[in-house]
């Protein structure tokens, strides 16, 4: 927890941020909460970014104040105005790009005092993998595909029956650059699979971890996938 210090006789208030990750080409949220005030007009929220001269966003007297906003954030930022009164200073960022990564500061002034906390914001690309049986292959083969990742992830196969087995010798992973020349399509093929087994394709980089599971029996195929963001640390 980072606690802001008091200035000019004012007390310090607690401001809490959570390190988070943004998926490029989506809207992102930079989380920040603070000790609420009873009067909206007494609350000032300033978002700043290390290395950026202008403000990322400013909210004061119950409304946005964007005259000092840096050009790189023009038209892209918003606070949740109806939630400021309950201590939510989180920032919405439109169309996240790689260049949005960095250290942000959430700075709060209320009638109770001042406080701030830093937030480490990572940007990249992550997507859900889909695992399918590759019927075109000569032997029983699984194909795991995920459309967008950045930075380049690692891909690891696992199976329920052969727990702890190393499938690197019987799998092949390729990365194909997408048309926007940043993100990549991930394709991993697993050979010599056996029936009545559950296989997992795990894709991971320093931002996210995603898993695609497939259970193949003689009568049916069951699929499941999930994704989790990494490094969500409160400060």
């Amino acid at each position: 927890l980072i606690i802001g210090f008091g200035i000019s006789g004012r007390h310090s208030i607690t401001v809490t941020t959570v390190a988070s990750a943004g998926n490029i080409g989506e809207d992102g949220i930079l989380s920040c909460t603070f000790e609420p005030d009873i009067k909206l007009s007494d609350i000032v929220i300033q978002w700043l970014k290390e290395g950026v001269l202008g403000l990322v966003h400013e909210f004061k007297e119950g409304k946005d104040e964007l005259s000092e906003q840096d050009e790189m954030f023009r038209g892209r930022t918003a606070v949740f105005a109806d939630q400021v009164i309950v201590g939510n200073a989180s920032l919405r960022l439109k169309n996240v790009q790689l260049t949005d990564a960095g250290t942000y500061k959430c700075y709060i002034i209320t009638s109770k005092g001042k406080g701030n906390a830093n937030l480490e914001y990572k940007t990249g690309a992550f997507s859900m993998p889909e695992v399918n049986v590759d019927y075109n292959a000569s032997s029983e083969t699984l194909r795991c595909e995920a459309p967008r990742w950045f930075p380049q992830p690692t891909v690891v196969w696992a199976s329920q029956v052969d727990q702890g087995a190393n499938f690197s010798e019987v799998s092949n992973t390729s990365f194909e650059l997408n048309s926007e020349n940043v993100t990549m399509k991930v394709v991993s093929v697993l050979y010599n699979v056996t029936i009545n087994n559950t296989y997992s394709c795990m894709i991971e980089n320093d931002i996210a971890k995603a898993t695609g599971d497939i259970k193949v029996t003689e009568s049916e195929i069951k699929r499941r996938s999930h994704l989790q963001l990494l490094n969500s640390k409160a400060s």
């Epitope: 998926n23 080409g25 946005d64 964007l66 038209g75 105005a81 439109k94 997408n178 926007e180």
Partner: antibody
Framework: EVQLVESGGGLIQPGGSLRLSCAAS????????MNWVRQAPGKGLEWVSV???????DYADSVKGRFTISRDNSKNTLYLQMNSLRAEDTAVYYC??????????WGQGTTVTVSS | EIVLTQSPGTLSLSPGERATLSCRAS???????LAWYQQKPGQAPRLLIY???SRATGIPDRFSGSGSGTDFTLTISRLEPEDFAVYYC??????????FGQGTKLEIK
């Protein structure tokens, strides 16, 4: 030059299907939020659908389950597949790029008429 | 659902006069996500103002935007003949993701 050119409109019977295309030049479609916006005769603008840079999609309630937005990154082209068309879908359909600064690039529009 | 209500529905003015168009939201809208468009008959809309007050590229400085929260205004300081058109405000970020106002028709008196 940054430009969007729509095509694929026409006269279609209720219940029919149509696919609109929007060819982009001068910028990369997959780096932007790309939208379809329509305008019924004599009416105002109505947002229809968006495809985010990530490929995720969103729709207005009036077209959800009937319309599908997609893009072909290799062709730098946006599409709108319209199924189960109704008379109230009759409109000029525009594709528009939502850059960071609002919908700053629009196509010329393509007319869809749904009538028996 | 955010509803944008524009007023007046029609505004009749003469060239050289000042035009003030209003856009009121049913709930708070971020200034960053509020835009204004101009549309002439048979043409596609054109972006005028983004972020409530920033002029888009190539837009003359007689056009200005202001406001925050639920009340936004588009002002044309001195009307030129080519300014007579329909004007729409638009918000981003709520459900539905984009919403347009119903439009204000600016006509020659």
């Amino acid at each position: 030059e940054v430009q969007l050119v729509e095509s694929g409109g026409g006269l279609i019977q209720p219940g029919g299907s149509l696919r609109l295309s929007c060819a982009a030049s001068g910028f990369i479609v997959s780096r932007n939020y790309m939208n379809w916006v329509r305008q019924a005769p004599g009416k105002g603008l109505e947002w229809v659908s968006v495809i985010y840079g990530s490929g995720r999609t969103d729709y207005a309630d009036s077209v959800k389950g009937r319309f599908t937005i997609s893009r072909d990154n290799s062709k730098n082209t946006l599409y709108l597949q319209m199924n189960s068309l109704r008379a109230e879908d009759t409109a000029v359909y525009y594709c528009a790029r939502d850059g960071d600064y609002g919908m700053d690039v629009w196509g010329q529009g393509t007319t869809v008429t749904v009538s028996s | 659902e955010i509803v944008l209500t524009q007023s007046p529905g029609t505004l009749s003015l003469s060239p050289g006069e000042r035009a003030t168009l209003s856009c009121r939201a049913s709930q708070s809208v971020s200034s960053s996500y509020l835009a204004w468009y101009q549309q002439k008959p048979g043409q596609a809309p054109r972006l005028l103002i983004y972020g409530a007050s920033s002029r888009a590229t190539g837009i003359p400085d007689r056009f200005s935007g202001s406001g925050s929260g639920t009340d936004f205004t588009l002002t044309i300081s001195r009307l030129e003949p080519e300014d007579f058109a329909v004007y729409y405000c638009q918000q981003y970020g709520s459900s539905p993701l984009y919403t347009f106002g119903q439009g204000t028709k600016l006509e020659i008196k």
